[in-house]
């Protein structure tokens, strides 16, 4: 079958890097600047992703290949392939349409990006909170209370929040 | 009692792309972060990403960021890990795991999918 | 991301040994700090979490203790069943990170 269609179609030989130029009795022609191929066979050039304003070029763009954008800093990515960026809050906070918000009193966020969490249900598990949480820091869970030997003290104060904490992803 | 059950081993050629699977049970699959392990013949482990079912939210380390997609399914109290576009530094023991009550600690660990990339 | 050095990364004891592994942050981790035992096996076990917390079931000869960037992970009296590879990992910061490892021999 291979082989059939390089005969039909002489664009089927045409390398990633390239394009069938109908315009030169199809003769593979390297993309022009700017422009890629990721596969063989293809009658055009996609044009090359620009990384301008708050997104920055992780990768360049090759012939084969598109650029691939981040965020700078201040800022993370989201979406499939870093299609937008988005700004960074504090540990402790989350963006909201007003800009970053402290956690409320039982929710956390150990990370400058998302949302803030309600502290962990120990208790589902049938543990006990062995480290408080904070608005930066979930509570450690420790073992059941029965499992604690008498006299022992079930909770530890929280442990103090630092910079840079969880680094945005 | 609190179990995490994976996919079995795969053998792959290069390029090619796998998706392991980890099943949960024991337990409520949404309250728990599930990540994933990376351990390569005869060395450490590496840690991968991480998914909160509940939300699908996903913590990835950036060395795998091109490499791992990590998903989750509440219906079935199932965590995937795809590898795309494999190579030979592929080939390892995965492993998924269960944090024991926030997420700084992997409490449960699953038996480990072994993946080879071979020609 | 943080770096964890550990040691040593194989050791050799009799049964009834104590034995003592270290583990250093590159930076402080406060007491976010995991041990974990790999069987021969490849099957693995959270021992002691947030620097010397015992899981629930684990034997009163294993003991963690540390904080910041020095951490020590002790066997008090070694056992035949002990034979494995123990790892330290930090959880206060993403991503995680994992020491080398320690394999564990007895003599």
């Known amino acids: 079958f291979e082989r059939t269609r390089s005969l039909q179609d002489p664009c089927s030989n045409c390398p990633a890097g390239t394009f069938c130029d109908n315009n030169r009795n199809q003769i593979c022609s390297p993309c022009p600047p700017n422009s890629f191929s990721s596969a063989g066979g293809q009658r055009t050039c996609d044009i090359c992703r620009q990384c301008k304003g708050v997104f920055r070029t992780r990768k360049e763009c090759s012939s084969t290949s598109n650029a691939e954008c981040d965020c700078t800093p201040g800022f993370h990515c989201l979406g499939a392939g870093c299609s937008m960026c988005e700004q960074d809050c504090k540990q402790g906070q989350e963006l909201t349409k007003k800009g970053c918000k402290d956690c409320c009193f039982g929710t956390f966020n150990d990370q400058k990006r998302g949302i803030c969490r309600p502290w962990t249900n120990c208790s589902l598990d049938g543990k006990s909170v062995l480290v408080n949480g904070t608005k930066e820091r979930d509570v450690v869970c420790g073992p059941s209370p029965a499992d604690l030997s008498p006299g022992a003290s079930s909770v530890t104060p929280p442990a103090p929040a630092r910079e840079p904490g969880h680094s945005p992803q | 009692q609190v179990q995490l059950v994976q996919s079995g081993a795969e053998v792959k050629k290069p390029g090619a792309s796998v998706k392991v699977s980890c099943k949960a049970s024991g337990y409520t699959f949404t309250s728990y972060w599930i990540n994933w392990v990376k351990q390569a013949p005869g060395q450490g482990l590496e840690w991968i990403g991480n998914?909160?079912?509940?939300?699908?939210?996903?913590n990835y380390n950036q060395k795998f960021k091109d490499k791992a997609t990590i998903t989750a399914d509440k219906s079935t109290s199932t965590a995937y890990m795809e590898l795309s576009s494999l190579r030979s530094e592929d080939t390892a023991v995965y492993y998924c795991?269960?944090?024991?009550?926030?997420?700084?600690?992997?409490?449960?660990w699953g038996q480990g999918t072994t993946v080879t990339v071979s020609s | 991301d943080i770096q964890m050095t550990q040691s040593p990364s194989s050791l050799s004891a009799s049964v009834g040994d104590r034995v003592t592994i270290t583990c250093r942050p590159s930076q402080d981790i406060s007491n976010y700090l995991n041990w974990y035992q790999q069987k021969p096996d490849k099957t693995v076990k959270l021992l002691a979490y947030?620097?010397?917390r015992l899981r629930s079931g684990v034997p009163s000869r294993f003991s963690g203790s540390g904080s910041g960037t020095d951490f020590t992970f002790t066997i008090s009296s070694l056992q035949p069943e002990d034979i494995a590879t123990y790892f330290c990992?930090?959880?206060?910061?993403?991503?995680?990170?994992f020491g080398q490892g320690t394999k564990l021999e007895i003599k």
């Open positions: 990992q930090q959880g206060d910061t993403l991503p995680y990170t």
């Open positions: 947030y620097t010397g």
């Open positions: 795991t269960r944090d024991y009550g926030s997420a700084y600690s992997m409490s449960t």
């Open positions: 998914i909160y079912p509940s939300d699908s939210y996903t």
